[in-house]
């Protein structure tokens, strides 16, 4: 089902431990994350916020497969967590460290 | 050659003809669009500016690639192009068409 | 405006489970953590847990084996759980909203655990 | 795993400085945070310092925190106290054991 398997946002939960990141993440022990998984077909959907370049690049790759790669579906904005971490043996409190979910994802 | 495969620019020619657009590109008949290609594997290089997401996401992938996909190798920043176009009938002159051409790849 | 009520029972038998749910509104679970916290009768201030904005979960290793905390985004609530309960975990148990700083809390529910 | 050790009660008259101490058991007091907490009787605490210094919008400036290294302590001082200071005064740090650790509370009478 290609609709099925089109760029969207599913769920991904980081295990800090998973990834050695205890070692200076005391808090939480992991989080939901997501991740964008899917294809990038031509035509791209507005809700995927497709730049011209995407959009180009995808119609070429539709065209000639050979000439150029699919655009790909990757977060298009990403939201901060809470988090208490080891900062030069201090532990510290941030409210809001950045760039760490996923909120939307799009083809670029 | 892992680093040759390594996540980068690379030229893309987009002939405005063979997508259709010259029905309403008047000029140029194409342009040099470059596409980013290649493989973001941990650890992510500091050039193609990974979000913290990325990292976790090529970490986990590399601890457990069914777990998580690769992060993706994307234009980070687009630059415009300027067109001659035809709006409603009247030939007109864009002198910045925006994000139209890659001009950095990064891994997202 | 930002509001944390706690709802669940006055009394609990010896050896039952305790439940309570912290409703919020005028912030997402998303964006804020929430702490439980609870005072015995005339004593001190004991953090439980807290449910984290990325919906990881932290608990107090003297609770870990017999609390669960857990959320309904969609609600706005966070619920706590806490099995096996004898006479000393009598206390008021608070949810507070913890952004830059602990900011709000709610009133507290008084639970007396008695047969 | 270490603990905040607070007096149990304080006095002070209206008008005076008082200084309340939070003693960090093991362990370095600087090595994070204290918060401060006030609590009156049968209320929800509210928070009057922050990162050890720092007031929250609305706290009184003559609610002020810091610390001394060398006798391992946290201190919230207030100036030219208030009738409607007297309440149960928790210090709060962390730890990587148990996350959020609490003062067993200091009740400061206001004379």
């Known amino acids: 089902n290609a609709k099925g398997n089109y760029c969207k946002r599913t769920p991904l939960y980081i295990d800090f431990k998973e990834i050695g990141w205890d070692s200076w993440i005391i808090a939480p022990p992991g989080y939901e994350a997501y991740e964008c998984r899917g294809v990038c077909n031509y035509p791209l959907a507005e809700h995927l916020t497709p730049t011209k370049h995407a959009i180009i690049q995808a119609l070429v790759h539709l065209k000639n497969s050979q000439k150029a790669s699919k655009a790909c579906c990757v977060p298009t904005k990403l939201e901060p967590i809470s988090i208490l971490y080891l900062d030069k043996g201090v532990v510290t409190y941030k409210f809001k460290y950045e760039g760490m979910a996923v909120s939307e994802c799009g083809c670029r | 050659n892992a680093k040759g495969n390594y996540c980068k620019r690379t030229p893309l020619y987009i002939d405005f003809k063979e997508i259709g657009w010259d029905s309403w590109i008047i000029a140029p008949p194409g342009y040099e669009a470059y596409e980013c290609r290649g493989v973001c594997n941990y650890p992510l290089a500091e050039h193609l500016t990974p979000t913290k997401h990325a990292i976790i996401q090529a970490l986990v992938h590399l601890k457990n690639s069914q777990k998580a996909s690769k992060a993706c190798c994307v234009p980070t920043k687009l630059e415009p192009i300027s067109i001659l176009y035809l709006d409603k009938g009247v030939v007109t002159y864009k002198f910045k068409y925006e994000g139209m051409a890659v001009s950095e790849c990064g891994c997202r | 405006q930002v509001q944390l009520k706690e709802t669940g029972p006055d009394l609990v038998q010896p050896t039952q489970t305790l439940d309570i749910t912290c409703t919020v509104s005028?912030?997402?679970?998303?964006?804020?953590?929430v702490h439980w916290v609870r005072q015995p009768p005339g004593k001190g201030l004991e953090w439980m847990g807290t449910?984290?904005?990325?919906?990881?979960?932290d608990y107090n290793s003297a609770f870990k084996s017999r609390l669960a905390i857990s959320r309904d985004t969609s609600k706005s609530e966070v619920f706590l759980k806490m099995d096996s309960l004898q006479t000393d975990d009598t206390a008021k148990y608070f949810c507070?909203?913890?952004?830059?700083?602990?900011?709000?809390w709610g009133q507290g529910i008084m639970v007396t655990v008695s047969s | 795993q270490f603990a905040l050790i607070q007096s149990d009660s304080m006095s002070t008259s209206a008008g005076s400085t008082v200084k309340l101490s939070c003693k960090r058991s093991?362990?370095?007091?600087?090595?994070?945070?204290v918060y401060w907490y006030q609590q009156h009787e049968g209320r929800s605490p509210t928070t009057m310092i922050y990162?050890?210094?720092?007031?929250p919008d609305g706290v009184p400036d003559r609610f002020s925190g810091s610390i001394d290294s060398s006798s391992n302590s946290a201190f919230l001082t207030i100036n030219d106290v208030q009738i409607e200071d007297e309440a149960v005064y928790f210090c709060?740090?962390?730890?990587?054991?148990?996350?959020?650790?609490f003062g067993g509370g200091t009740k400061l009478t206001v004379l």
């Open positions: 005028g912030f997402s679970l998303t964006t804020y953590n």
């Open positions: 990162d050890g210094d720092k007031r």
């Open positions: 449910m984290w904005n990325g919906g990881g979960i």
């Open positions: 093991t362990g370095n007091i600087g090595s994070s945070y």
């Open positions: 709060q740090s962390f730890s990587s054991g148990i996350k959020f650790i």
């Open positions: 507070a909203r913890l952004g830059y700083y602990v900011d709000y």
